[in-house]
């Protein structure tokens, strides 16, 4: 529920991790809570301890296997429960039938590097991390470049509507320091959201040659 006093939200990274956030107004910080995951067609179940991330929210990661193992598919349903300790017993607080491939959030792209830099242009590449082979090429990217004197929020978004793990930035200013970030999103999933932004990649354009514009 959007307007309630509590909210339980989870996302699947498409491989072996379900990340969950439980927020509850007025809850005590030292409340001990867990997320329990029970798949409908798998032999395993998993639990993680919710740890405080802010005044009224807790988060944890359900680690389902090794980072690149494919632990769930589009037909899986995982029943997720929030259990909180009340005295000597555990009380269920929330329950959710979780469809992993309807609630995707991939890991941030990694291994950003400058392939080639000139005075006005820079070619940058990156890799996606722990992304399911099920997507094949059905991914899109957003990128942004931080210019001097601006904030990330002011940076215009560049959209790559295909699985393209590189970009050629144009119309840059010579001898100028920039930063670059990229994020990824599968096309699949009603509640799928963008990955976190990658770590920023800093680069500098080449100075203009003397005697030229």
């Amino acid at each position: 529920a959007v307007n309630g006093t509590s909210r339980f939200t989870c996302f699947y990274n498409s491989r072996a991790n379900i990340s969950c956030v439980w927020s509850q107004d007025g809850a005590l910080q030292d409340t001990s809570c867990q997320v329990h995951a029970w798949p409908d067609r798998r032999r395993w179940n998993q639990t993680c301890e919710l740890l405080p991330v802010s005044q009224a929210s807790w988060a944890c990661n359900l680690i389902l296997g090794t980072p690149d193992s494919q632990k769930l598919t589009a037909v899986d349903i995982v029943t997720l429960r929030v259990m909180c300790r009340e005295g000597v017993r555990w009380r269920m607080m929330a329950i959710q039938d979780f469809k992993p491939f309807e609630n995707l959030r991939l890991m941030a792209p990694i291994s950003l590097q400058v392939v080639h830099v000139e005075t006005h242009r820079c070619n940058i590449s990156w890799k996606i991390s722990q992304a399911s082979h099920y997507f094949e090429r059905h991914l899109e990217f957003e990128a942004r470049t931080l210019s001097p004197g601006h904030t990330w929020e002011e940076a215009p978004l560049m959209t790559l509507k295909q699985k393209q793990e590189w970009i050629c930035l144009e119309t840059l200013t010579p001898d100028t320091q920039y930063e670059f970030q990229v994020r990824v999103k599968p096309l699949q999933g009603e509640f799928t959201t963008w990955s976190p932004w990658s770590q920023p990649l800093a680069f500098r354009t080449k100075p203009a040659a003397l005697g030229k514009d």
């Epitope: 529920a1 959007v2 307007n3 309630g4 006093t5 509590s6 909210r7 339980f8 939200t9 509850q24 409908d40 349903i77 029943t79 269920m92 607080m93 929330a94 329950i95 959710q96 039938d97 979780f98 469809k99 309807e102 609630n103 509640f191």
Partner: nanobody
Framework: QVQLVESGGELVQGGASLRLSCAAS????????MAWFRQAPEKEREFVAL????????LYADSVKGRFTISRDNARKMVYLQMNSLKPEDTAVYYC???????????????????WGQGTQVTVSS
């Protein structure tokens, strides 16, 4: 938008059975939580039972455990509450509620739920 319409409420004698129905229409979610709440005069709305739409997991208030059964028919987009061994204290307006994904909240709190029906009156006489 999700629309919920309850039916089946009536006046019955203590010890009788009754089945309430809730018809869902509009943009229904395959992974929503569906619940029944009830509200007696001068009292707060209270949780009765819940069913998860996909897996069919169920939860009940202690006061109705063993007497009430919640079920659903996915194809018809219906949720039911079978009420047996009714008692006068079960008298209330019964509401169907839905908690739409991708969020869920504290299941027994009424302010968690996004969508509500208009209610159906159940009266149990002694």
């Amino acid at each position: 938008q999700v629309q919920l319409v309850e039916s089946g409420g009536e006046l019955v004698q203590g010890g009788a059975s009754l089945r309430l129905s809730c018809a869902a229409s509009g943009r229904t979610f395959s992974n929503a939580n569906m619940a029944w709440f009830r509200q007696a005069p001068e009292k707060e709305r209270e949780f009765v039972a819940l069913i998860t739409w996909s897996s069919g997991s169920t939860l009940y208030a202690d006061s109705v455990k063993g007497r009430f059964t919640i079920s659903r028919d996915n194809a018809r987009k219906m949720v039911y509450l079978q009420m047996n061994s009714l008692k006068p204290e079960d008298t209330a307006v019964y509401y169907c509620a839905a908690d739409g994904p991708p969020y869920s909240g504290t299941y027994y709190r009424y302010d968690t739920y996004d969508y509500w029906g208009q209610g159906t009156q159940v009266t149990v006489s002694s």
